[in-house]
Amino acid sequence: TQNKALPENIKYGIVLDAGSSHTSLYIYKWPAEKENDTGVVHQVEECRVKGPGISKYVQKVNEIGIYLTDCMERAREVIPRSQHQETPVYLGATAGMRLLRMESEELADRVLDVVERSLSNYPFDFQGARIITGQEEGAYGWITINYLLGKFSQKTRWFSIVPYETNNQETFGALDLGGASTQITFVPQNQTTESPDNALQFRLYGKDYNVYTHSFLCYGKDQALWQKLAKDIQVASNEILRDPCFHPGYKKVVNVSDLYKTPCTKRFEMTLPFQQFEIQGIGNYQQCHQSVLELFNTSYCPYSQCAFNGIFLPPLQGDFGAFSAFYFVMNFLNLTSEKVSQEKVTEMMKKFCSQPWEEIKTSYAGVKEKYLSEYCFSGTYILSLLLQGYHFTADSWEHIHFIGKIQGSDAGWTLGYMLNLTNMIPAEQPLSTPLSHSTYV
């Protein structure tokens, strides 16, 4: 008989990443018969929810339903109706909600309560809304990139399926930068750790991994900027803050109440003789870099080696994938190429930050001014964090790969989270039977 293709049994999953600055909905799909194979799940859609992060809805929770509507309706369109009831939906909230919970557990729960109420109105199988830990965020990001890079598959290939794939099974480290926190996760050379808080052990596809991870709350790019402003306004002689991290000619009024709203600025809080101050950009990379370095306390370390603020960091090992805002910022600045050295990146940042604001606005007319104005700070912050915070060097810089997507799927914690919660990462290597995955008769 002639070979006929059978309709493939496809499954779907939805994960909402409720970040500090915005929420994104990701839709994943995979062949049902292959769910224990490595590398078969891929992203079919990303929908960015219009508006800020869910923590900003704390005083207007009744608007959360409308906020989520467009992307949930998009999911309804993308996923075949016959699959709706079977499709799991997860929402994970990250550092923005961790900060809200620090201020008020009750308010954080109220937000999540309304999120569940809203998501339960859709035909999908809602599994839960929760605030994930920083450790989970780091670990799931690490799982995502290594899953997509094929690092967990035991089959050695003579060809490379993705640009960063070396043929060895050495895992990539994961560098994740959000608005409110940043994570570093990798397998260190030395398996014994001085800090059990930073140690994770996984058995994936029949192999054991001893992983180091840490999440730095308040060191995402947006909260780091608030910290820097709060620190610098302490020593300002009046209500004008001449700021090297903004372009020359840039001006912006900041409310002191907004500055002190976040728990991240508490350590710098003081009574100021004004309610508002004006940022005036002077566009000087070197001075901006110096100002940023003051956010990292490197004077105290109770371990053999630390990142900053007394947090253990083992010696860096292997290649790293840097994603989320690490990628978005560096991609905007056109600095993601593997060929660009750290010295060249610094040079380009110096040039970029010194460009007049009017010139920048003209060159990037399509970009929202709020975002555009912060790229000088964000780029400088990324360099400072990677070099002084995590101790990358000019030589080890070439081991950092700025990654947006891997084979069409966004790098980030959401895929790893779904793989874990749907039990699609087996501890043991699945036995492959030659006929079990056939779609032909």
């Epitope: 009831q85 799991p88 997860y90 729960d109 999540l112 309560d113 569940e116 109420r117 339960s120 199988d125 809602f126 599994q127 839960g128 809304a129 929760r130 919660l421």
Partner: nanobody, 126 residues
């Protein structure tokens, strides 16, 4: 791992009411769907009802719809089962169940990883 402690079982006449409680220690309570299952002598454990983390989704077995109500109080880490119009066939050991980041629908199918309480006896007899 969460720990579950049931209370409220006992002997009741047909047509009577009973309220079971299940208190959870350890874990973040709102991250768990909670449910009740029952096992009559010589029978398998059967699904009765389940509720989502913040209480907006509930599922009931057909045999108890309209008579039993599940609810939760996240401030007390407690889930309740209000049982009205009890019948002799409701006699069983009732087990509280918790499933992390799992829908009530999946609990109904006994899918995912479920943590069980010790069980409390409910006897409906005149």
């Amino acid at each position: 791992e969460v720990q579950l402690l049931e209370s409220g079982g006992g002997l009741v006449q047909p047509g009577g009411s009973l309220r079971l409680s299940c208190t959870v220690s350890r874990g973040t309570f709102s991250e768990y769907s909670m449910g009740w299952f029952r096992q009559a002598p010589g029978q398998e454990r059967d699904f009765v009802t389940a509720i989502s983390g913040f209480g907006h989704i509930t599922h009931y077995a057909d045999s108890v719809k309209g008579r039993f109500t599940i609810s939760r109080d996240n401030s007390k880490n407690t889930v309740y089962l209000q049982m009205n119009s009890l019948k002799p066939e409701d006699t069983a050991v009732y087990y509280c169940a918790a499933a992390w980041q799992t829908s009530p629908r999946r609990m109904m199918q006994m899918a995912g990883s479920i943590t069980w309480g010790q069980g409390t006896q409910v006897t409906v007899s005149s």
